[in-house]
């Protein structure tokens, strides 16, 4: 069964800057990745970035840099200033659409006891939805 993992890290150099890493553990080819915060995309969550392997990347503030790390994982850096900046208990969600598996989504947040610059290892988060 495919799984999605989500890792959230607060940067040591900028305490209000976050890095979100997400990956897809499956055999299918990925057609789209959506990163949102506050909950799943379209269900209380606000889209931060959309990544397509061929068509490119769209991102919106406070997202600063979204990129592919591998063919099945992405990373997103968030700016941390202003009213739209994330806080420590913000939930981030990643949705991977792949063929032929369908859509798989998981969410994660900063570990409660994490120090700046540290994060929990990227373990598969609970799968919220499989379309």
């Amino acid at each position: 069964t495919p799984e999605v993992w989500v890792q959230v890290r607060m940067e040591a150099t900028e305490l209000s800057s976050f890095t979100i890493r997400c990956g897809f553990l499956g055999s299918g080819s990925i057609s789209l990745v959506t990163v949102s915060w506050g909950g799943p995309n379209g269900a209380g969550g606000t889209t931060l970035a959309v990544l397509h392997p061929e068509r490119g990347i769209r991102q919106w503030a406070p997202a600063r840099q979204a990129r592919w790390e591998t063919q099945s994982s992405i990373s997103l850096i968030l700016e941390g200033s202003g009213a739209s900046s994330p806080c420590a208990n913000t939930t981030f969600c990643c949705k991977f659409a792949s063929f032929p598996e369908g859509s798989w989504e998981a969410c994660g947040s900063l570990p409660p006891s994490s120090d700046p610059g540290l994060s929990a290892p990227p373990t598969p988060a609970p799968i919220l939805r499989a379309d």
């Epitope: 789209l32 889209t47 068509r55």
Partner: nanobody, 127 residues
């Protein structure tokens, strides 16, 4: 809940121009649909797809409006526009904004999967 609100309709003479707008809003979060599209329904006729634009800016148009209508989105991703030039009497219709998501971020054909719809704005082309 997601709401779509259209504006910009009205009465215009043949050959004239109008610009329709649509804003997707939601309580408590910002909804950026993968696909936003315009549909229209002329009096006594069925619903017709006019134009669509996906999250990456890819556009599709009905043959009947190609070269006359231009669909666009704002950079924030939740506002939709339709610039209508060289309007004809046969463009008279109620114009609906629709939005939704798709597995690959593209606009699905014929509006399939567009699960949010506005109330519509009337466009009348008459001399």
């Amino acid at each position: 809940e997601v709401q779509l609100v259209e504006s910009g309709g009205g009465l215009v003479q043949p050959g004239g121009s109008l610009r329709l707008s649509c804003v997707a809003s939601a309580s408590g979060f910002t909804y950026r649909p993968y696909c936003m599209a315009w549909f229209r329904q002329a009096p006594g006729k069925g619903l017709e797809a006019v134009a669509g634009i996906d999250i990456f800016g890819g556009t599709t148009y009905a043959d009947s409006v190609k070269g006359r209508f231009t669909i666009s989105r704002d950079n924030a991703g939740f506002s939709l526009y339709l610039q209508m030039n060289s309007l004809r009497a046969e463009d008279t219709a109620v114009y609906y904004c629709a939005a939704g998501d798709s597995p690959d971020g593209r606009c699905p054909p014929l509006g399939q999967g567009l699960n949010y719809w506005g109330q519509g704005t009337m466009v009348t082309v008459s001399s």
